[in-house]
């Protein structure tokens, strides 16, 4: 009796859709998976007796539920089938967006980049899939704990008045407010202001 | 059920253009996402464009940048694809679809409905 494929799970970050496994123990020798998706109601394979423990789903329907099923395999046995169910809209991961962040005088300059999608056009990004699409923005003083958050409605926005020759460190990320999901945060970008540009009377 | 039905192609040379039409019969072409694939002599299927409604984008494959645009009529119920500085490698044929859900652009599992196809030849 070959034993099922363990811990499979769905590891999809911005419909890069990776379906994993874990090979089971099993002492006759080394294990081959097949995966498979259901589509029009007949199981079609993805990735056919593979000695991978991933198989690589982004290519599905943004939209619907999608049943993947996997199996082990060796010589002419196999495995019953592990089946999980995934919404590639509703359960992808909101990877971090990209920023870019200029400094002048006393303000920071922010712009953001929405995250980029497997197998689409590099101008259609997650901002194109999701209506509600719009970036959460912390930002603190480097070396304290006090964070402030804004929600700017554009792809950029300005932080002004800030104390001169002071860092600043910022991150941003994905949300969707009509789904109240967030996603994941950049790594924090810290710059240093420079001197007040009020002219002295 | 929908019928897209595509026009325009033709035989051409390398250097010409054309101009396909897409239109849905009986229906109007109000979906989110419409777009263009092609598929060339032995090869698989290949997106080409799309246009959004929510926002009037408009996205492309690295092959064609520059070359093609793409645009809708929404008075006359038309998707257009003008195919500018053709070379032999566009010969293909070309496919118009539509998206109910709109959240794809490139992939043809995001889309819906198909037309049967126009024939693109670039040939000298």
């Known amino acids: 009796m070959v034993p099922p494929p363990e811990n499979v799970r769905m590891n999809s970050v911005n419909f890069k859709n990776i379906l994993q496994w874990e090979s089971p123990a099993f002492a006759k020798g080394n294990l081959t998976f097949t995966a498979q998706y259901l589509s029009y109601r007949i199981f079609q394979d993805k990735c056919m007796n593979t000695t991978l423990t991933e198989c690589d789903f982004s290519s599905l329907s943004k939209y619907g539920d999608h049943t993947l099923r996997v199996r082990a395999e060796f010589a002419d046995e196999h495995s019953d089938w592990v089946n999980i169910t995934f919404c590639p809209v509703d359960d992808t991961i909101i990877g971090p967006p990209g920023m870019q962040v200029e400094v002048l005088a006393d303000s920071l300059h922010m712009r953001f980049l929405a995250p980029k999608i497997e197998n689409e056009y590099e101008t259609w990004t997650m901002k194109n899939v999701y209506n509600s699409w719009t970036y959460n923005v912390q930002y603190w003083k480097n070396g304290t704990d006090e964070k402030f958050q804004i929600t700017p409605q554009y792809d950029f926005e300005v932080l002004r008045n800030l104390e001169p020759w002071t860092t600043y460190c910022v991150q941003v990320r994905g949300f969707l407010p009509d789904r109240n999901k967030a996603g994941e945060w950049s790594e924090p970008v810290c710059e240093q202001t420079t001197h007040d540009e009020t002219v002295p009377s | 059920e929908v019928q897209l039905v595509e026009s325009g192609g033709g035989l051409v040379q390398p250097g010409g253009s054309l101009r396909l039409s897409c239109a849905a019969s009986g229906n109007s072409l109000d979906y989110p996402t419409i777009g263009w694939f092609r598929q060339a002599p032995g090869k698989g299927l290949e997106g080409v464009s799309c246009?959004?409604?929510?926002?009037?984008?408009?996205h492309y494959a690295d092959s064609v940048k520059g070359r093609f645009t793409i645009s809708r009529d929404n008075s006359k119920n038309t998707l257009y694809l003008q195919m500018n500085s053709l070379r032999a490698e566009d010969t293909a044929v070309y496919y118009c679809?539509?998206?109910?859900?709109?959240?794809?652009?490139?992939?043809?599992?995001?889309?819906?409905?198909w037309g049967q196809g126009t024939q693109v030849t670039v040939s000298s």
């Open positions: 679809a539509a998206s109910l859900h709109g959240l794809g652009c490139k992939s043809e599992a995001d889309y819906d409905y």
């Open positions: 246009i959004s409604a929510s926002d009037g984008s408009t």
